[in-house]
Structures are given as structure tokens and as C-alpha cells.
Amino acid sequence: QKKGAPHDLKCVTNNLQVWNCSWKAPSGTGRGTDYEVCIENRSRSCYQLEKTSIKIPALSHGDYEITINSLHDFGSSTSKFTLNEQNVSLIPDTPEILNLSADFSTSTLYLKWNDRGSVFPHRSNVIWEIKVLRKESMELVKLVTHNTTLNGKDTLHHWSWASDMPLECAIHFVEIRCYIDNLHFSGLEEWSDWSPVKNISWIPDSQTKVFPQDKVILVGSDITFCCVSQEKVLSALIGHTNCPLIHLDGENVAIKIRNISVSASSGTNVVFTTEDNIFGTVIFAGYPPDTPQQLNCETHDLKEIICSWNPGRVTALVGPRATSYTLVESFSGKYVRLKRAEAPTNESYQLLFQMLPNQEIYNFTLNAHNPLGRSQSTILVNITEKVYPHTPTSFKVKDINSTAVKLSWHLPGNFAKINFLCEIEIKKSNSVQEQRNVTIKGVENSSYLVALDKLNPYTLYTFRIRCSTETFWKWSKWSNKKQHLTTEASPSKGPDTWREWSSDGKNLIIYWKPLPINEANGKILSYNVSCSSDEETQSLSEIPDPQHKAEIRLDKNDYIISVVAKNSVGSSPPSKIASMEIPNDDLKIEQVVGMGKGILLTWHYDPNMTCDYVIKWCNSSRSEPCLMDWRKVPSNSTETVIESDEFRPGIRYNFFLYGCRNQGYQLLRSMIGYIEELAPIVAPNFTVEDTSADSILVKWEDIPVEELRGFLRGYLFYFGKGERDTSKMRVLESGRSDIKVKNITDISQKTLRIADLQGKTSYHLVLRAYTDGGVGPEKSMYVVTKENS
């Protein structure tokens, strides 16, 4: 190109359809210059113009020769250029923001613009750059790219941005530009110019404000607070902690709190102070709702479903910010809501859902929601399998007969379609409790009835009941306890009887024991005693309870004594005992010793004993007839342990074993014994019968049985030199080697001569008795031997 000719040809396009080509005019040319522009490829087109630019339709691929001829007053000049698409720049039109708005409550900016895609024929990707600036000084706070696609028509685009600083704190500006990325265009692609700026600012409705107000945020987040003020802010505090001030426009300030801690239930207090005033706000830092845990749905009554759950981690948000729960049943579409001020505990929450007719299977979703998020749990239940019955109420007991009662109770709910399994607890006083299970059909009217048999007459029972459904889920709580005394029945057995002849042998004394409650079947009022022989039967007058003894004058003939117990309902079967005693000449008195609590008696099996055995016992020191108690044992027994609360250690008892045959009793064994032996309580009395120069003869007396306290096994006789009332050691003091001891095991021996003594010497003598229970106390005496003659 010659100097002074058109130069610097540049072509740009904003839509790939039209190229806008411009050049610089030759130096020295002014207005009034005309240009002829010719474009030549296979054909040639020329255009006459009066300006230094031309709009031409986009040229197809390949090189084009452009000739620009400038015609001016002092001649003409021509320039030639080679042009193809690679020399063309694609620069989009400057975009325009249609709308910039703000939601101050969430500190969010909303941006809206048009991509003007209708002027662009080709599908292309567009990159938008969005710039957010803050404060009058327009500090850049956000630069973001946003991708869209041009699709041949005008499209509105939206972008939103949540500011880390409340929008009220400072003016915010937004501008945008774009860049078109077209795969088919081989030229240069460049950014558009920035759009005209738009801004958002808050018009204060009062002198001073703190932002945000009542904001709910996630624990661990960062948050910015600001104070929009006309007066100088001196300090900012979160709780009692000072925070550094960030200066904004004018007197406005901000503070940034990083990694905020969980708030107390009331929130966290933030204050800004000025010379004259104080301004505050509250932030609530908490957690989104945890997934509801242990979600469980059950019913008490098949009318209402109770769904309960544990809320899990505490959100630290209460009141209007607390978690609200919605229980949705998906088959029916029905739902119920729970809104509660959350207490800072993990107690169980619950919701009630009315059961729907003819629906047994429920698909529940529990949705939890608070300002920080939501969560859910689901459960699918067949509600007939999840019945947790109410506690049975109005529990009553009525008699049917002496061994059966009728139990009735109330169990609210419509259970017509299911069966109950109820557990009845039956407790007799002083006895183990019994459990009985009954299956009963559920009813609509809530009233239930069951009969209970196999009870004992005249027995105080305590009943209680609990129920579950047959497809077990949970037992109900136990009903209240009900005490009930069954009615009386005739005594089931006659009294346990025994007889003794009086000491003069003329009267027969009949003894009987009170019937145990389970045989008395009621309160025993009286006893009938009768006496019969082959010739006659004689009845005594009725003997009122609690007398358990009767005396009849009898000769030595055979009589059968009958004892019958009577209560308000009737009489027991008679207890019969023969007056006759079968003699036994072959009797030795044996010794027996017990085992601390009782005494074991054994005997050989005797096939002749056809009725039973009786063991009777008494205190040896008691006068005749000797009877403390008796025990009957079956005829096939060969041993029994006799125990009695009246047995005492160290007391001698007589035991008699009787066998019964042909309705008569024969004494088989006679024993004396102790349930436990003790040491004698006294020492034997002894005297010196004779003294010589080298010997002493000692004689002693028996210890009375009561003071022996066991079977006497022997005596211990100690002797050694010793004088009365001197400091010389006594016989039983330890360490004496000159003391001699004689153990006398022949308990019939009552004298002892001690020989080989020294003459005219004082001896200390000691005598002690012993049993298997121990050695008794000592009796001592001082004796001086005679002088040697």
C-alpha cells in the first residue's frame, strides 16, 4: 500500500452474518472523500461510499481481494488487502442488564438479562462474566462465569448470588460482559464491553440498624454483621467479646465472625455501641434436623396410631425456629403435623394419626424441617401386628364356686378382628406366684371376661392381668392388683390325730392338729369326736375350735376313735385312730444326735406296718403323758427328719417311733437325743473320801440331765501340787509341766484314787465333765496328803 492510501483494514462481526470492515483514511484527506470498495473472489462486486467503513455479508471460506480506491480533490489512491474469516474478530454487542433486584431478608441479589440470541443464527456457547462490586469505592467482591447457549431466539437469563454481607450494609453494583464461542468460526473471538452498571442500595427506615436480624445459620459458618449508622460506631461485641470493626461507607461498619459456635437456645447476642447508644441483633447458630431415629408406630386401641421417634442430635433452635415434623401416610395421602418448641433433651417425640377404615398397612414418612434443612424417616407397618394394648382397667373378680372365679376387665379399643393373649398372675399369700395364659377373642365394646378354675377354696389370692395381641408386639402394662378370697368348701381331709393314755391309764387323750388352710377349705368352727367299738358308737359333744384335744374314759378294749372337722360348708372325712397299743417287750433306749436344726431318724423297712409310722417327741424333763408333737409318715418310709421351731440346743428330747398295723400302734423304738449337744453347764460335785501320805480317793456325783446339755462322754481330772491363796500357779494355768490329767471315759465310774503322791504336800484337784458339745466348767479343791509314818 502506497503512503497516503487507505490502510489498517479491520473487520469485526457481532453475529457472524455481517462483517463490519473499517479502515484508516489516507493522511491529508478530509471530508468529501469518496471510496470505491471492490471485493473479488470468483466474481467482483464494487460499492461506492462516503465513509471509512462498510458492512458486508459474511464471506464464505477462502481468501478475498479487497480493493479500496479513495477519490479526493487532489487525486486518487488505491490499496489492496487480502481478507478471510481468520482476520475477522467476533465481538458480541455490549450486553444490557434488564433488572437487578434484591431479597434483603436472605441477602440475595437477582440479576436478569437478555442474550439477544435472535440476531445470532448459529447455535453457540456463551460465557458470561458477572462482576459484583461493593461500597462507593466499588471493591470487587465476586467475579463469576456463567455458561449459556444461544439458540436463535432471544432468551432471558437469571443469576442469583447470596452475599456474605447483608445487602443493607453497603451499596452493591453489578455489571456483565460476554464471550461467544462458536465452533464454526475460525476468526478471533473477543469479550464484549462491560454492560452499564446497575446498583442496589438500602434506604434506611430509621437512624440506625443492625443487620442481619434474627438470622439462622449453620454452626461452623462464617457470618458478617453490620451497623448502618449516622453516628460513629465505637465497638462491636458478640456476647462479651470485642470484634474488630470493618469500615464501610460513611459511619457504617461490619464485623466478621468465623466458624460460629452453637448458640444458646435464646440465640447469640451481637451489639454495636456508639458514644450515646447501643444497638443489637441476634443470630441463631444451630443444626438442620437429624434423621428421626427409632421411628416406631403402634396403636393402643386400633383407632389411633401413635408414631414416636427420637429427634437425634439437638438442633439448638427453639420456638419458631424449632423443627417441625410432618407425618405423611402415602397410601391415603393423609398427614398430621407437629410443631414444638424444642427442649434441649433427647426425649421421645410423638404424633397421633387417626386410623382409616379397612386399612391395616400404613406407609409412614416422617419429614423433619427447620430453617437449616430437612430430613426424613420411613416405616411400613401392618398396624394389627403393632398393638400395644392400654392397661386393663375396671379389673374385677367374682366367684363362680369355691375353686373358680370370673375375671372381668376393660380394654378400650375396637379389637373385633384380632385375638388377645392375656397373662393372669395368680399370687397366693406366702407362696410362689403362678402365671396362666388365656387366649380370648377381641371385641368391639372393650369388655372382657374369662373364667379361672383350679383354685383353692377359702384362699386369699391376688390377681392382676396384662394383655398382648396373639401376634405378639408388646405386653400392656399390668392392671391394678385385685385381692379376692375364694368361697369355702367342705374340709378335704380329716385332722392329723394321735392318742395317748393318761398317766393313770384310765383315760384316752385324743389330740389333733389344725388342718392346713389348703385342707380346711374354710374357717374350722368345731370338731366332732366319736368312739366306736363292735358293740356301740359314742359321740362326744361338739368341740369348738381352737381346742385340739379331747379326753375319753375307756377300758382296755379295742376302740376306733373318729375325729371330724367342720366348717360353715360341711364336714371333713373322718380321721380314724385305734385306741389299742400293741405291746413290744424288746425295747432299748437309744441315743440320737441331730444336725443343728433337726434330727434324722431312720428304721428298717417292715412289711407288717400297713398304715403308717408315727414319730412323737417330747421334752425329757416334762411329766407324763409325754407329748410335744408328732409326725406321721407313710408306711413305705424308712427315714424322716424331725424339725421343729421349738427344738433348742442342749435340751434332751424323747423320740418314740410307732408303727401301725391292723389299726393298732406298736412302739418300735424309744430314743433320747439332742438336736445339738452343748458343753455341760455345771461341773460335777466331788468330795475327798480318803487321804493317805501317798494317795487321795475322790468321789463325785452325777450331773442332772438338764445341766449336762448333751450325752456325757467322760470326765477330765487334773491334779498337781498347789496351795490355796498363794501366788503358786493353779493347776489349769498353762506352761505347767508337773500337772497330771486323767481322762475317765467310763461314765458309770464315780470314784478315783490318785496314788504316788508326796506326803504332807498340798495338791490342787480339778474335775470337769464333757460331752460331744464341749468341756464343762471346773470344780476345784485343795487337799494336803498325810505325813509319812
Epitope: 444497638f279 443489637g280 441483633t281 420456638g319
Partner: antibody, heavy 123, light 108 residues
Framework: QVQLVESGGGVVQPGRSLRLSCAAS????????MHWVRQAPGKGLEWVAV????????YYEDSVKGRFTISRDNSKNTLYLQMNSLRAEDTAVYYC????????????????WGQGTLVTVSS | EIVLTQSPGPLSLSPGERATLSCRAS???????LAWYQQKPGQAPRLLIY???SRATGIPDRFSGSGSGTDFTLTISRLEPEDFAVYYC?????????FGPGTKVGIK
């Protein structure tokens, strides 16, 4: 139990001064922000001033700024209100009130009040 | 300053009736900073509700508070004879801490 007892009220001429005291007991005085609130005869409540628990900050109602001074002596468990340049419109029952101890809040409502002391400004 | 207005004016009700008292702020008040007090003749005020809805210690549950922004309410579900008094709302979120003019609840 918490007790607040005001004293120092009386009749005073316009332009004169008066000092009110509030004796506190039954709580840790030094942990609580304290306020003065007044009530003109037959009228509503009007907040007068606040002093922080440690005495570091004091704030006043506009009409008393520059005339009234709130102070406290934590060693004596006592709150004071020095009232200078008294005006007829300052006539009221003056209550001292304790802030509710609300975690570590510096802005709280008033949970305990004294029975009040009457200040009459009259010539 | 934040100006609080209370309505209605004097309220005449019978024991057992429900009382609804309103408090309106001239500008938005954080719900954390609104309290209600009760005052009987010759007595000091007593704190009933703080933080819009939290009952103070010893206050019976027939007293409840609600509201947000500029509108707040105190509700007495069933008036007892001892509830007839003057009720004040107060904001304590920015100084000066202002009280409403009060609503008198009298016996009909």
C-alpha cells in the same frame, strides 16, 4: 432472695440536684447490667439509663443526656443516679431494675425491680 | 428511636374471658428483643414475657406471646381476678429502650 431498694427521692426545686441510690442484695451484683426506669404520676413507664455490669458503658434517654449520670459501686452493691438541672417534667417514681441474666447477652429485659422512690421537682 | 404503640385502649373484660393485647413498632424489631410487663396499682412492674414468646420464671401458662417484625401480641387465655392490671410492651434491642404507653385490662 433478690432485693432492690431505692432511696434518695424527695421534693426538690427546678435546677437543683438529687442523687438516688439503689441497694442490691441476694445476687452477684457485679454480674448484672442495671437500669433506671421512671414513671410520671398516672403515666406509663419511661426508660432512663443503663450501666453495664462492669461500669464500662452507659447509655441514656435523650431528654436526660448531659443532666443525669448513672454509676455503680460493685464493692458496695449499689447503683446510683446523679440528677442535675432538674426540671418539672422529671417528676416521677424512679425504679432501679436488674437485667435478666440471659447467657452472655448485653441486651436483656428487666426481671427484678425495686419498689421505687418518688422525686418531685417543684418550686 | 423505636416508638411502640399499644391497642386497644382500656379493655373491659370478665374473669374467664380471653384477652388479646397488641403492640406495634414504628420500625422492625427483632423478636428476640420484645418483652411484656404487668403492673398493678402501687406496685413495680413484673416481667411476664421476653424474646416475644418466652415466659419469665413463675409466670402461669395462660400468658403467651407471639409476633414478629412490627406486630406483637400478648394473649391471656382465661383471665383470672389477679390479671386485671396495666400491661406494657418494651423493646430492648436498641437504645433508647422504649416502652409502649400501656393497655389497661379492667373488670367489666
Amino acid at each position: 432472695q433478690v432485693q432492690l431498694v431505692e432511696s434518695g427521692g424527695g421534693v426538690v426545686q427546678p435546677g437543683r440536684s438529687l442523687r438516688l441510690s439503689c441497694a442490691a442484695s441476694g445476687f452477684t451484683f457485679s454480674s448484672y447490667g442495671m437500669h433506671w426506669v421512671r414513671q410520671a404520676p398516672g403515666k406509663g413507664l419511661e426508660w432512663v439509663a443503663v450501666i453495664w455490669y462492669d461500669g464500662s458503658n452507659k447509655y441514656y434517654e435523650d431528654s436526660v443526656k448531659g443532666r443525669f449520670t448513672i454509676s455503680r459501686d460493685n464493692s458496695k452493691n449499689t447503683l446510683y443516679l446523679q440528677m442535675n438541672s432538674l426540671r418539672a417534667e422529671d417528676t416521677a417514681v424512679y425504679y432501679c431494675a436488674r437485667e435478666l441474666r440471659y447467657f452472655d447477652w448485653l441486651l436483656s429485659p428487666f426481671d427484678y425491680w425495686g419498689q421505687g422512690t418518688l422525686v418531685t421537682v417543684s418550686s | 428511636e423505636i416508638v411502640l404503640t399499644q391497642s386497644p385502649g382500656p379493655l373491659s373484660l370478665s374473669p374467664g374471658e380471653r384477652a388479646t393485647l397488641s403492640c406495634r413498632a414504628s420500625q422492625s424489631v427483632s423478636s428476640s428483643f420484645l418483652a411484656w410487663y404487668q403492673q398493678k396499682p402501687g406496685q413495680a412492674p413484673r416481667l411476664l414475657i421476653y424474646g416475644t414468646s418466652s415466659r419469665a420464671t413463675g409466670i402461669p401458662d395462660r400468658f403467651s406471646g407471639s409476633g414478629s417484625g412490627t406486630d406483637f401480641t400478648l394473649t391471656i387465655s382465661r383471665l383470672e381476678p389477679e390479671d386485671f392490671a396495666v400491661y406494657y410492651c418494651q423493646q430492648y434491642g436498641s437504645s433508647p429502650f422504649t416502652f409502649g404507653p400501656g393497655t389497661k385490662v379492667g373488670i367489666k
